[in-house]
């Protein structure tokens, strides 16, 4: 199964991925690629990790912003674009045969509700509303054009707005 | 120029051992995953094994984890493939590939392959 | 495991033809789907990778298109070197398998 995490164009993403390294400090070489993980290594690499360095960042939107010597591995991509949407891979590449530990997850980048911050909104959509599905893999980010994004049903929508209400949000409808 | 040499093919009796290595030059050896695949003769291709870049991740095809062990040896540029009770249906030419890479790419498909060395398992 | 299926297994064509060889995976790798050609007793040569995506050096006249389970290699007008063995392969699920192989005769 997948979680599939919900952000709002021009918000930050973050899309968690941890492992605890064994013994402490002994780090692995992780890497975050746009499209399901595929046989080996991430596909599409956004990022890696090395020993204690980032490498292979291939825009300025991408983060570790998390204290990844210590397994926070998570990724955090700044002001999304509907082009963000798709399923990313964190490969935590643990030494050994086969041993690699796999997590695709499912960003979904909606266009902005019609909703005006209250000044203490301050979080991502994404770390509010991540969603368990029970659907299989899905493929390449390359291969799903905004076009054929998943609709956001109603019920999301409801949380969405009272959740922004609740936190003192003026809603234009 | 790439260039991937294979060696350590041969004539060897079922149950017997022999280590295949592959000398690369033209290249940062140790930036690239390396991968071993056979072809038997008159067939298709067949993956074996994948080693990552630092060594420190293997992959095999299940059928052989048990009795092949890949390899490589960053400071000499060299792959290995260590075979191990061999049977008669290993026998084929043995290719050493590199893994496709580029800045933001995976290595999952093999832009470079030496010219094979053939084993032969035969009693 | 899985399976790639190519066809046809031989195919018989004269310089200038346009060719298509099909590839089909029992499931769906999406665009995990990589073209090599191999002449007789040569090693493989990448063709193209991510189903679509021309290796540099690789002539136009070659092309890769499908995703999901079915996928196409097409030659726009065979030359006298195209005359090989090609394979699919995909790097979607483990083990990476390749098709069985499409031989291109000289009609």
């Known amino acids: 199964s997948e979680v599939e995490y919900i952000a709002e164009v021009g918000q930050n993403a973050y899309l968690p991925c941890s492992y605890t390294p064994a013994p402490p400090g002994n780090l692995v070489p992780v890497c975050w690629g746009k499209g399901a993980c595929p046989v080996f290594d991430c596909s599409n690499v956004v990022l890696r990790t090395e020993n204690r360095d980032v490498n292979d960042r291939t825009s300025g939107r991408y983060w570790l912003k998390g204290d990844f010597h210590k397994g926070d591995v998570s990724l955090t991509i700044e002001n999304v674009t509907l082009a963000d949407s798709g399923v990313y891979c964190c490969r935590i590449q643990i030494p050994g045969i086969m041993n690699d530990e796999k997590h695709n997850l499912k960003l979904v980048v909606i266009k902005p509700a019609k909703v005006t911050p209250a000044p203490t909104l301050q979080r991502d959509l994404t770390s509010a509303f991540p969603r368990m599905l029970t659907t299989g893999e899905h493929g390449p980010a390359e291969t799903q054009t905004p076009g054929s994004l998943p609709d956001v049903n109603l019920t999301q929508i409801f949380t969405l707005t009272n959740e922004l209400r609740d936190s003192g949000a003026t809603i234009r409808t | 120029e790439v260039q991937l040499v294979e060696s350590g093919g041969g004539l060897v009796k079922p149950g017997g051992s022999l280590r295949l290595s592959c000398a690369a030059s033209g290249f940062t050896f140790s930036d690239y995953y390396m991968t071993w695949v056979r072809q038997a003769p008159g067939k298709g291709l067949e993956w074996v094994s994948s080693?990552?870049?630092?060594?420190?991740?293997?992959y095999y095809l299940d059928s052989l984890k048990s009795r092949f062990t890949i390899s490589r040896d960053n400071a000499k540029n060299s792959l290995y493939l260590q075979m191990n009770s061999l049977r008669a249906e290993d026998t084929a030419v043995y290719y050493c590939?590199?893994?496709?890479?580029?800045?933001?790419?995976?290595?999952?498909?093999?832009?470079?392959w030496g010219q094979g060395t053939l084993v032969t398992v035969s009693s | 495991d899985i399976q790639m299926t190519q066809s046809p297994s031989s195919l018989s064509a004269s310089v200038g033809d346009r060719v298509t060889i099909t590839c089909r995976a029992s499931e769906n790798i999406y665009s995990y789907l990589t073209w090599y050609q191999q002449k007789p007793g040569k090693a493989p040569k990448l063709l193209i990778y991510n189903a679509k995506t021309l290796a540099e050096g690789v002539p136009s006249r070659f092309s890769g298109s499908g995703s999901g389970t079915d996928f196409t290699l097409t030659i726009s007008s065979l030359q006298p070197e195209d005359f090989a063995t090609y394979y699919c392969q995909q790097h979607y699920g483990t083990p990476l398998t390749f098709g069985q192989g499409t031989k291109l005769e000289i009609k």
């Open positions: 080693i990552n870049y630092d060594g420190r991740n293997t």
């Open positions: 590939a590199r893994g496709y890479y580029y800045y933001g790419s995976s290595p999952n498909y093999f832009d470079y």
